[in-house]
Interface confidence: medium
């Protein structure tokens, strides 16, 4: 069986986690990928999912989440914004295939996110200015329900899975504060 | 494996600006974090920013912010860093150092170790 | 910013030496640690990434461990090639931060 990985990222409450998944260009570049959490005892539940077929580096924002699959490069990034305690757990990127149950990308991504100041905008000196401009779209997160003995994934409330985003700009002050540290099971 | 190549050195006066080129060539641009180091006379090495070409978003330390601008030109391969508002303790060798960020599965992250530097280029500020 | 410390700032040694380097950090970085040597008048080279992997083309006389707070660059055998400076350098949050370097020297 496959040895599966995590990497650690130990971040604060307000920061930005930033990472991404790599996935093989020529099967998955415009195959459906989501982002999902598995908590304890719990099967996979999608957070956020990119369309189908996935736009080439066209931002898709579910809440806090945003996702961006990069075609030519293979690679989706994904950003959880404004962390909070609650966001702590195991995540991962997947790769949707129906009817057979979805890819996973390795590793997966155990999140900490602890209380404790992490500046303002602007204040803090490791923060980056950047802001990101996602497109004045509505983003429907369509993503599909799979259940098997191995995988089940839910999609996201309806509350969250509309997202209307006329003009907005997201201010992503802590891209760079994160502490990354991988952990081998 | 990618190769840098920076720009020729640069006489500056106080209060100008200089801007340096650093030109990737032998690899794939966008799968690299490209950073700006710089380094005083006598000193030690000293990290200004940086920039993910494939996202166009830079990086920069709190010392530098507002001052340097480092940007990326896609079609042509190449990086480059502004300073501004020179003053003589910005004399220094500057670098461009790459990361190569694209795993073959994971690698969750976009800079580490700066693994190819640039020859470097002498900026000299003086009156 | 997270600071790095590196002692000692000079060594003098001889050729076939084994020499020691560290580098601690103030505060936890896992294994996110660079090692470079750098000679006059030279760009830094990559020797050692997650503190402890190797670059390519790296001869093994080099060697890094540590995690957490304290890293050590090793030498087993000094060869004439070695004398140069060294720097450690963070990668596990920004801004990236580098040690002051130290520097070997012929005894």
């Known amino acids: 069986a496959t040895k599966l990985t995590e990497e650690k990222y130990e971040l604060k409450e307000g920061q930005t986690l930033d990472v991404k998944c790599d996935y093989t260009l020529e099967k998955f570049a415009s195959s459906q990928k989501a982002w999902q959490i598995i908590r304890d005892g719990e099967m996979p539940k999608t957070l956020a999912c990119t369309e189908r077929p996935s736009k080439n580096s066209h931002p898709v924002q579910v809440g806090r989440i945003i996702l961006e699959d990069y075609h030519d490069h293979g690679l989706l990034r994904v950003r959880m914004v404004n962390l909070q305690v609650e966001d702590s757990g195991l995540y991962q990127c997947v790769i949707y295939q129906p009817p057979k149950e979805p890819h996973m990308l390795f590793d997966r991504i155990r999140l900490v996110v602890t209380k404790g100041f992490s500046g303002t905008p602007g204040s803090n000196e490791n923060s980056t200015q950047n802001v990101y401009k996602i497109p004045p779209t509505t983003t429907k997160a369509l993503c599909p329900l799979y259940t098997s003995p191995r995988t089940v994934t839910q999609a996201p409330p309806k509350s969250t899975a509309d997202v209307s985003t006329p003009d907005s700009e997201i201010n992503l002050t802590n891209v760079t504060d994160i502490i990354r540290v991988p952990v081998f099971n | 494996q990618v190769q840098l190549v920076q720009s020729g050195a640069e006489v500056k006066k106080p209060g100008s600006s200089v801007k340096v080129s650093c030109k990737a060539s032998g690899g794939t641009f966008n799968r690299h974090a490209i950073s700006w180091v710089r380094q005083a006379p006598g000193q030690g090495l000293e990290w200004m920013g940086g920039i993910i070409p494939l996202f166009g978003t830079a990086n920069y330390a709190q010392k530098f912010q507002g001052r340097v601008t480092i940007a990326a030109d896609e079609p042509t391969s190449t990086t480059y860093m502004e300073l501004r508002s020179l003053r003589s303790e910005d004399t220094a060798v500057y670098y461009c150092a790459s990361s190569y960020f694209y795993g073959s599965g994971s690698s969750n992250y976009y800079y580490y170790g700066l693994d190819v530097w640039g020859q470097g280029t002498t900026v000299t500020v003086s009156s | 910013d997270i600071q790095m410390t590196q002692s000692p700032t000079s060594l003098s040694a001889s050729v076939g030496d084994r020499v020691t380097i560290t580098c601690r950090a103030s505060q936890g970085i896992s294994s996110w640690l660079a090692w470079y040597q750098q000679k006059p008048e030279k760009a830094p080279k990559s020797l050692i990434h997650?503190?402890?992997s190797l670059q390519s083309g790296v001869p093994s006389r080099f060697s890094g461990s540590g995690s957490g707070t304290d890293f050590t660059l090793t030498i087993s055998s000094l060869q004439p090639e070695d004398f140069a400076t060294y720097y450690c350098?963070?990668?596990?949050?920004?801004?990236?931060?580098f040690g002051g370097g130290t520097k070997v020297e012929i005894k």
């Open positions: 350098q963070q990668y596990n949050s920004y801004p990236l931060t």
């Open positions: 997650a503190a402890s």
